[in-house]
Amino acid sequence: IWELKKDVYVVELDWYPDAPGEMVVLTCDTPEEDGITWTLDQSSEVLGSGKTLTIQVKEFGDAGQYTCHKGGEVLSHSLLLLHKKEDGIWSTDILKDQKEPKNKTFLRCEAKNYSGRFTCWWLTTISTDLTFSVKSSRGSSDPQGVTCGAATLSAERVRGDNKEYEYSVECQEDSACPAAEESLPIEVMVDAVHKLKYENYTSSFFIRDIIKPDPPKNLQLKPLKNSRQVEVSWEYPDTWSTPHSYFSLTFCVQVQGKSKREKKDRVFTDKTSATVICRKNASISVRAQDRYYSSSWSEWASVPCS
Amino acid sequence: RAVPGGSSPAWTQCQQLSQKLCTLAWSAHPLVGHMDLREEGDEETTNDVPHIQCGDGCDPQGLRDNSQFCLQRIHQGLIFYEKLLGSDIFTGEPSLLPDSPVGQLHASLLGLSQLLQPEGHHWETQQIPSLSPSQPWQRLLLRFKILRSLQAFVAVAARVFAHGAATLSP
């Protein structure tokens, strides 16, 4: 058993049929010594008396808010949550496995630049009685500070018969050094509580590996005289790190016909313009990637040819 | 070239070679970012590689003030990785095929380090740890970890030379 926050405790249980459970001793936070009784949740049934209560925690029915009273007055509360371990593996019932980039990916994180700011998100099908708390640091043995905001519901989607809820959180490294080569990864820890179930999820990454630039901006076409060719030009996204002579991007320009089956013409360039042939009903798209480190490509920015 | 008097390197040449290094480092093992490298007996592996840290003057402002600190750090790293790529970790079993990009990568690391430090001028170099894995699978794991950290190192070096070529070239 360990304290999650004031008056909230997590009991770690090996979860299998007829498991013995854990013996837990609760102590009433009061100077009083006599006439103390204990109840669980809304029930008025007295579970025991005295300053301490010893209980055997085996299942969710044994978890909940234990309250000690004296003469009708509430003295203190202790909320017990359960953390299940099945076959040596902690349960992951609350969040959905996003399976990208690999199985058992519950948290996904992205950064738009090297400023030390990043966003993480996760998915669940649970709609109520759900709370999240997020902590982060750079490194684990001698951790350096990363400040995270509160997790918020950022999207709702319908997936077949199920509703899926996306939560996200923004974090910022306290003393970020954008030009340095990271040697210690960022660690992100999410505590999830659904009713009386506690779970924790972690992710470890370098900012460089989660970079995904915003799409190029101000994508424009300029027809070239007496030619089917056009000059495509664009700019670095506003959110990308500066100066651009240091934090450089590379670009992929694609000409795509109306039909998905049509052959795509692709050009790669480090410049912010390119000359391509504009076919009728086609569209031109440009995306960006860090020039020197193969992290994710941005989403496409597109304009029609006509 | 970075010579004892602290004059400028051939920024444009360094830019071209460092960008080539980036390409080679990724082609040497493109999947490296998606490998699950957590294995038993794997803790001590590449914690000793030189990193370009915050105080090394490799940021745009530091380069403007005095690029020598940063160039020395990059040079140390290039020599370090060049030695690792020439060691038993990469020459031992399982063997790399003759057309593996690791050979080109090794040569390019040497080429860039020589551009930064011509004959007769010696910067201090960092001690190369004696990593001599006894098992072929450990050698394989070390390769991936070394390539992964090399990818990060050469990315910073390439940014430095790109910025230098754009803003510090005479």
Epitope: - | D36, G92, S95, L96, P136, W137, L141
Partner: antibody
Framework: QVQLVQSGAEVKKPGSSVKVSCKAS????????ITWVRQAPGQGLEWMGE????????YYNEKFKGRVTITADKSTSTAYMELSSLRSEDTAVYYC???????????????????WGQGTLVTVSS | DIVMTQSPDSLAVSLGERATINCKAS???????????LHWYQQKPGQPPKLIYN??KPESGVPDRFSGSGSGTDFTLTISSLQAEDVAVYYC?????????FGGGTKVEIK
């Protein structure tokens, strides 16, 4: 075509040594390793060790505690396995096999004993 | 040393029936999660062994009735429809750690 031709059968006294040769042809000798495997009569296979002429690396089965020495002569494309302090339980067929042990992006850990010698019967008897 | 335990020691199967050979390692013989350092060899009487499965991949020329599966410590070689020419002793071999070790062998015969 690839061939590994081993030296002929040997009868040895306990305490003596035996040196089995394995002449390789039909491929570039230094591009592959040579592995030695033995098989006692009616028994299973036992890996003794292997040598890679290109890297110069030799790996041994510690079970033989310094009794086995594996070498290669690049000039004649011949591998050798010497076993000393022979005892009756060393009676076995000794095989050499070509070892391909490579790493590529597609196959990061490819190991194959793809061609084998015909085997050399070593009998240890007083 | 990694100990490789094969089961069963011998197996008699009717022609056209399925034969399943198991190999259990005393330690994990996969590398970084998925790459297998476990191989299967076939040895017919009076002949040297022949590689049939390399990691998770069949060697070229090996009939597709042979299939290898497994990861971590438990591996299986399956012959989906036994043919007369499949009568042999089958060995698993791990080359994750030196010394490389073979399983004790499984003799496959026709019932």
């Amino acid at each position: 075509q690839v061939q590994l031709v081993q030296s002929g059968a040997e009868v040895k006294k306990p305490g003596s040594s035996v040196k089995v040769s394995c002449k390789a042809s039909g491929y570039t000798f230094t591009s592959y390793g040579i592995t030695w495997v033995r098989q006692a009569p009616g028994q299973g296979l036992e890996w003794m060790g292997e040598n890679y002429p290109r890297s110069g690396n030799t790996y041994y089965n510690e079970k033989f505690k310094g009794r086995v020495t594996i070498t290669a002569d690049k000039s004649t494309s011949t591998a050798y396995m010497e076993l000393s302090s022979l005892r009756s339980e060393d009676t076995a067929v000794y095989y050499c096999a070509r070892a391909e042990f490579i790493s590529t992006v597609v196959a990061p850990y490819y190991y194959a004993l793809d061609y084998w010698g015909q085997g050399t019967l070593v009998t240890v008897s007083s | 040393d990694i100990v490789m335990t094969q089961s069963p020691d011998s197996l008699a199967v009717s022609l056209g029936e399925r034969a399943t050979i198991n190999c259990k390692a005393s330690k994990k013989v996969t590398i970084y999660g998925s790459t297998s350092a476990l191989h299967w060899y076939q040895q017919k009487p009076g002949q040297p062994p022949k590689l049939i499965y390399n990691g998770a991949k069949p060697e070229s020329g090996v009939p597709d009735r042979f299939s290898g599966s497994g990861s971590g410590t438990d591996f299986t070689l399956t012959i989906s429809s036994l043919q007369a020419e499949d009568v042999a002793v089958y060995y698993c071999l791990q080359n994750k750690e030196v010394p490389y070790t073979f399983g004790g062998g499984t003799k496959v015969e026709i019932k």
